[in-house]
């Protein structure tokens, strides 16, 4: 028996070869002897039943001259899995067709962190092995059900599942979209008074995007978190539902989700969590956003630089007179200089690779008041 593997919804070609390599009489039948199609000597394809009943079955007329009389089955169904008989030259060739199907659980659009289950449907009597490869090259293998927990952004794309049966294989391609923000976390460094822009780009594109979202904010100085804004998303159009009075955030009307805080103030420094619930999806998308605010001030004879917000303990806060060595540098959130000399002072927040934030303050001779550029 020859074995042919097929994929549901696609086409399969069942071989039948003549030893004489020329056109001859042939008939394809089901195992119960019902005739499917054949050629009885006039070079004309004769179907065994009504056209509607047999419109999925065909042969390759162009191959007949070479002694090849394949049975083509289009739009394969799982129930096409059976034995087919080709009769020619007083002999019978049996061809076994096994149709397989690989499907993804419920939906091919899944939230980051959710599980993907790939299920193999196979004909009775078959014992296939299956291996699936993710777009980033991760291999999973097992029985008829394969699961991947904690889907990540890199899992978006075409998954290739290879079904192996009796040394023959058939390949399935399934497009999976992982719904997530492009970044899990971001941090914004701002001087006091500057406008703050928060952007939440999505890592996927879909025709219609509908849902609702909210930004919760935990200010460093506050004892509890607070909802800063809630919004709706309808077909990629953003509409604000509710916004706090302080701060009064503004939100862009189009994607990517974009929030503007009119002024960076110490009382706003902290961490936020933007959640987005999508229509017909269980669970939510999350992006963390952090705000660090710097303030440089001069009061009487004291020049002070402070930062608020979630900073790494490795960050260095420095005060220096322009073009001079730092007067003070500490891995702390506040530094100061007593009796600073006149000139342009710089407050710098830096790490091993760069200056993250800089604020300048002009110290005037002692009889004047300070000027902040």
């Amino acid at each position: 028996k020859t074995l042919v593997l097929g994929k549901e919804g696609e086409s399969a070609e069942l071989p039948c070869e003549s030893s004489q390599k020329k056109i001859t009489v042939f008939t394809w039948k089901f195992s119960d002897q019902r005739k499917i199609l054949g050629q009885h000597g006039k070079g004309v394809l004769i179907r065994g039943g009504s056209p509607s009943q047999f419109d999925r079955f065909d042969s390759k007329k162009g191959a007949w001259e070479k002694g090849s009389f394949p049975l083509i089955i289009n739009k394969l169904k799982m129930e096409d899995s059976q034995t087919y008989i080709c009769e020619l030259e007083n002999r019978k060739e049996e061809v076994e067709l096994w149709v397989f199907k690989v499907t993804a659980n419920s939906d091919t659009h899944l939230l980051q962190g959710q599980s993907l289950t790939l299920t193999l449907e196979s004909p009775p009597g078959s014992s296939p092995s299956v291996q699936c490869r993710s777009p980033r090259g991760k291999n999973i293998q097992g029985g008829k059900t394969l699961s991947v927990s904690q889907l990540e952004l890199q899992d978006s794309g075409t998954w290739t599942c290879t079904v192996l049966q009796n040394q023959k294989k058939v390949e399935f391609k399934i497009d999976i979209v992982v719904l997530a923000f492009q970044k899990a976390s971001s941090i914004v460094y701002k001087k006091e008074g500057e406008q703050v822009e928060f952007s939440f780009p999505l890592a996927f594109t879909v025709e219609k995007l509908t849902g609702s979202g909210e930004l919760w904010w935990q200010a460093e100085r506050a004892s509890s978190s607070k909802s800063w804004i809630t919004f709706d998303l309808k077909n990629k159009e953003v509409s604000v539902k509710r916004v706090t009075q302080d701060p009064k955030l503004q939100m862009g009307k189009k994607l990517p989700l974009h929030l503007t805080l009119p002024q960076a103030l110490p009382q706003y420094a902290g961490s936020g969590n933007l959640t987005l619930a999508l229509e017909a999806k269980t669970g939510k998308l999350h992006q963390e956003v952090n705000l660090v605010v710097m303030r440089a001030t001069q009061l009487q004879k004291n020049l002070t630089c402070e930062v608020w917000g979630p900073t790494s303990p490795k960050l260095m806060l420095s005060l220096k007179l322009e073009n001079k060595e730092a007067k003070v540098s500490k891995r702390e959130k506040a530094v100061w200089v007593l009796n600073p000399e006149a000139g342009m002072w710089q407050c710098l927040l830096s790490d091993s690779g760069q200056v993250l934030l800089e604020s300048n303050i002009k110290v005037l001779p002692t009889w004047s008041t300070p000027v902040q550029p």
Partner: antibody
């Protein structure tokens, strides 16, 4: 391509000094913090020191504090480790490594040299 | 200083196995942890940074998780080239400190 090449290793007596160099190429050296990491024979990795991109800040492991000095010359794209009062336990392969710092949040050593061997023995 | 305790110190496994290595910090280091792989006579190689971020070019069978004091490196399906020594490194604060290493050997 991005490369770090250590040199200056050798055999030295206890109490003596040695200076290691690390030549950087293929990237903007002055934009990165740089580390020294060592590994004693058959042992694990031990972090030694870091110097910031502009040389303004230096931090050391307790085991080398006061004896080793990390420095850099950005005009020569070179990192140094001055090792004084060497001890037998300083015997190790010394690696230099580049630190990537992103947003003051993500940190990692992505490029390493092949290492230079220092043997402290009488 | 922050101490890093890595376990196990050695581990025997077979190709195709799922392997987990853990690292515990003596104090909260948020997500300031990286994982490095080292083969005999070679320099260490970065695998994962800031707890869960896969370094470019590193196979996706490597993944990291955790937060605070407990962290995990997982290799989903061991390949022959994965037999090496693995180190965690806390880069949350100075001085940086490595775990003592986990030697992954062929069973």
């Amino acid at each position: 391509q991005v490369q770090l090449v250590e040199s200056g290793g050798g055999v030295v007596q206890p109490g003596r000094a040695l200076r290691l160099s690390c030549a950087a190429s293929g990237f903007t050296f002055s934009s990165y913090g740089m580390h020294w990491v060592r590994q004693a024979p058959g042992k694990g990795l031990e972090w030694v020191a870091i110097i910031w991109y502009d040389g303004s800040n230096k931090y050391y492991a307790d085991s080398v504090k006061g004896r080793f000095t990390i420095s850099r010359d950005n005009s020569k794209n070179t990192l140094y480790l001055q090792m004084n009062s060497l001890r037998a336990e300083d015997t190790a392969v010394y690696y230099c490594a580049r630190e990537v710092a992103l947003e003051g949040y993500y940190y990692y050593m992505d490029v390493w040299g092949k290492g230079t061997t220092v043997t402290v023995s009488s | 200083d922050i101490q890093m305790t890595q376990s196990p110190s050695s581990l025997s496994a077979s190709v195709g196995d799922r392997v987990t290595i853990t690292c515990r910090a003596s104090q909260d280091i948020r997500n300031g942890l990286g994982w490095y792989q080292q083969k005999p006579g070679k320099a260490p190689k970065l695998l994962i940074y800031t707890t869960s971020n896969l370094q470019s070019g590193v196979p996706s069978r490597f993944s990291g998780s955790g937060s605070g004091t407990d962290f995990t490196l997982t290799i989903s399906s061991l390949q022959p080239e994965d037999f090496a020594t693995y180190y965690c490194l806390q880069d949350y604060n100075y001085p940086y400190t490595f775990g003592q290493g986990t030697k992954l050997e062929i069973k």
